[in-house]
């Protein structure tokens, strides 16, 4: 329906109607990340699978070069989960030094980029201090909320450390958006 | 409306419209779990309250025998939270042995079952190593994402250890889905 | 469209249709909290930004005095994330006493208040024991689910300790709802 109005002669329609199945939607799943150069003060962006397995894009929502492209203005629900995992060295020498082989924190940010505006906008952030004491640790950070987006906006997911992202399963790390 | 088209004679309609209130929806809440036999390599499934308190199913979305039944094909947002809790023995004997009375990890999986195929498909997984040191620990795992489902698909929630699930309050542990 | 029916003379319509852009929606973001008196057995409610930055309310969904007001009956998806942060004193005296300067737990509750009913209803709860051992700790709790609400219902977010809420960034702590 793409927003066309239903307006029989006897009735005034005030807002466009559309079929729900026609709305832009995407669910992207994790892939193995290739090391990429990133700016000093910006977390690296993840790239994603967009058509194999559980991943899909539809109705003009496209994925390209780490970005989800918003094809029409409106209110979108945006979500992501990133599962982090790492190894903590347990040797007494390292533990005494107080610097086990683990990050101090893990962070996920869903970011909006608008071509007409130089600075990206952080829409959602999940950040957690890491105090695991076992030799192997893993945990997810989940985010989801509704935002008003404009046609042409681009969305990406940034993380504090790409090397800690669990890319082994499509159900553990994912990113999606749909027009409400 | 169940997908019927609005097509006044002067206007071509390209996709079915439907009333939002007519869409399949469910929000299920936790109940005390009865110990059940489960296969060696598969996490046990939770069963749920589907009509008391905050729980409901509507518009042909039915709950039966641990499964949510998908009544029509389409894109669904599916979510669940499971709150886990446990006791960690603090006795020096156990702590010296390095094996406190707690799991190494906690995991929630939202799984899809298709009748034509015996193997379930894991849609969402939240998994976390447990390194709590206090005597009582508790924490939620939340999951939510959008999936394309087929009429007849069944959804369930599996957990790594049913005995650790907090079933005391309907707001702590829940499972839901709705057609977009 | 506000629910009005499309009913050309030759066709019976069984449920109201409406434009999606016409539905009540809100996304609220964190502000610095002013200390408020709260009842002994009830967690304090957060107040929110509703129009600056990423925050908005639309289509008769209003925010007033810590509450989101539901303008029409229907099924709503409701979500919130609260990021908590604190300092843990590391002095040997405190650590030996086993009572570092941190809470035993952190909790978020999304609560519904109905004027005709004296007791608030807890819709969603995320609660987590805190066992951080570092000097600074921080972590989010995310909640989201679908509920059937009535016109006039009010929603609020309660937390176990307002002083631990991270109010520094709108993407860390937020609260939203939208009619499905």
């Amino acid at each position: 329906l793409k927003g066309q109005e239903f307006a029989p002669s006897h009735q005034q329609v005030y807002a466009p109607l559309r079929a729900d199945g026609d709305k832009p939607r995407a669910h992207l799943t994790v892939v193995r990340q290739t090391p990429t150069q990133h700016f000093k003060n910006q977390f690296p962006a993840l790239h994603w699978e967009h058509e194999l397995g559980l991943a899909f894009t539809k109705n003009r929502m496209n994925y390209t070069n780490k970005f989800l492209l918003i094809p029409e203005s409106g209110d979108y629900f945006i979500y992501s989960q990133v599962t982090f995992r790492g190894m903590t060295s347990e040797s007494s020498e390292i533990r005494q030094a107080g610097r086990p082989n683990k990050p101090d924190s893990i962070t996920v940010v869903i970011t909006k980029v608008t071509d007409s505006y130089p600075e990206p906008t952080q829409l959602l952030m999940g950040t957690k201090s890491v105090s695991e004491v076992g030799s192997n640790w893993f945990q997810p950070i989940y985010l989801g909320a509704m935002f008003s987006l404009q046609e042409g906006d681009k969305l990406m997911v940034n993380v504090s450390d790409i090397s800690l992202v669990d890319y082994t399963k499509e159900d553990k790390t994912f990113f999606g958006a749909f027009l409400l | 409306l169940k997908g019927q088209e609005f097509a006044p004679s002067h206007q071509q309609v390209y996709a079915p419209l439907r009333a939002d209130g007519d869409k399949p929806r469910a929000h299920l809440t936790v109940v005390r779990q009865t110990p059940t036999q489960h296969f060696k390599n598969q996490f046990p499934a939770l069963h749920w309250e589907h009509e008391l308190g905050l729980a409901f199913t509507k518009n042909r979305m039915n709950y039966t025998n641990k499964f949510l039944l998908i009544p029509e094909s389409g894109d669904y947002f599916i979510y669940s939270q499971v709150t886990f809790r446990g006791m960690t023995s603090e006795s020096s004997e156990i702590r010296q042995a390095g094996r406190p009375n707690k799991p190494d990890s906690i995991t929630v999986v939202i799984t899809k079952v298709t009748d034509s195929y015996p193997e379930p498909t894991q849609l969402l997984m939240g998994t976390k190593s447990v390194s709590e040191v206090g005597s009582n620990w508790f924490q939620p795992i939340y999951l939510g994402a959008m999936f394309s489902l087929q009429e007849g698909d069944k959804l369930m929630v599996n957990v790594s250890d049913i005995s650790l699930v907090d079933y005391t309050k309907e707001d702590k542990t829940f499972f839901g889905a709705f057609l977009l | 469209l506000k629910g009005q029916e499309f009913a050309p003379s030759h066709q019976q319509v069984y449920a109201p249709l409406r434009a999606d852009g016409d539905k009540p929606r809100a996304h609220l973001t964190v502000v610095r909290q002013t200390p408020t008196q709260h009842f002994k057995n009830q967690f304090p409610a957060l107040h929110w930004e509703h129009e600056l930055g990423l925050a908005f309310t639309k289509n008769r969904m209003n925010y007033t005095n810590k509450f989101l007001l539901i303008p029409e009956s229907g099924d709503y998806f409701i979500y919130s994330q609260v990021t908590f942060r604190g300092m843990t004193s590391e002095s040997s005296e405190i650590r030996q006493a086993g009572r570092p300067n941190k809470p035993d737990s952190i909790t978020v509750v999304i609560t519904k208040v109905t004027d005709s009913y004296p007791e608030p209803t807890q819709l969603l709860m995320g609660t987590k024991s805190v066992s951080e051992v570092g000097s600074n700790w921080f972590q989010p709790i995310y909640l989201g689910a679908m509920f059937s609400l009535q016109e006039g219902d009010k929603l609020m977010v309660n937390v176990s300790d307002i002083s631990l809420v991270d109010y520094t960034k709108e993407d860390k702590t937020f609260f939203g709802a939208f009619l499905l």
């Epitope: 058509e51 559980l54 | 193997e119 087929q150 | -």
Partner: antibody, heavy 124, light 107 residues
């Protein structure tokens, strides 16, 4: 048992059309994509088209785009290849093949289940 | 499109021989490469996926290696049932493309 069975091949005149079918059984049809691959007599394998049975996304070999259309019917666990404006060089055995995906970001998998093939002959 | 070039086009070998087939991509395909075996009149069979992973039921004498643009399929000790044509396929970019094939014949 996981199985793919092609049908619909035959003799057709140049410029004609043919619709091939592929019936799938023994697995979750909506999870794995499916490709059509063809092999002309005495030649190697040539990838033709792919469809996501999950959401209907498609890809085609560049030379065939516009003439060939891949589609699916999830309710019937079936896949189709509509071939129009056929030419002599389209003569081949046509296979449908399941695109295994391991649900892991580490792997792209391969075509792990193949049908027996159906022969298409374009000749006047 | 990514071009896949196999070498040799054909080879003759004896039972027990170690056989190596190479596949070169015109641009990097990461590790997204599969190997197939095809016998006359039969459908192809998946041997190796993602450059080095053996498919279910494939004997351990088959192994794959490589990443980027250069890949190798090795049969450590050729068996009578291994005489067939072998194809590589890149799965990095659409359209998927196959190599032209390598025919392994009995010496």
């Amino acid at each position: 048992e996981v199985q793919l069975v092609e049908s619909g091949g035959g003799l057709v005149q140049p410029g004609g059309s043919l619709r091939l079918s592929c019936a799938a059984s023994g697995y979750d049809f909506t999870y794995y994509g499916i490709s059509w691959v063809r092999q002309a007599p005495g030649k190697g394998l040539e990838w033709v088209a792919w469809i996501s049975t999950y959401n209907g996304n498609t890809h085609y070999a560049r030379m065939l785009q516009g003439r060939f259309t891949i589609s699916r019917d999830n309710a019937k666990n079936s896949l189709y290849l509509q071939m129009n404006s056929l030419r002599a060089e389209d003569t081949a055995v046509y296979y449908c093949a399941r695109e295994n995906y391991y649900g892991s970001g580490a792997y792209r998998g391969g075509m792990d289940v193949w049908g027996q093939g159906t022969t298409v002959t374009v000749s006047s | 499109d990514i071009q896949m070039t196999q070498s040799p086009s054909s080879l003759s070998a004896s039972v027990g021989d170690r056989v190596t087939i190479t596949c070169r991509a015109s641009q990097s395909v990461s590790s997204y490469l599969a190997w197939y075996q095809q016998k006359p009149g039969k459908a192809p069979k998946l041997l190796i996926y993602d450059a080095s992973n053996r498919a279910t039921g494939v004997p351990s004498r088959f192994s794959g290696s490589g990443s980027g643009t250069d890949f190798t399929l090795t049969i450590s000790s050729l068996q009578p049932e291994d005489f067939a044509t072998y194809y590589c396929q890149q799965r990095s970019n659409w359209p998927w493309t196959f190599g032209q094939g390598t025919k392994v014949e009995i010496k």
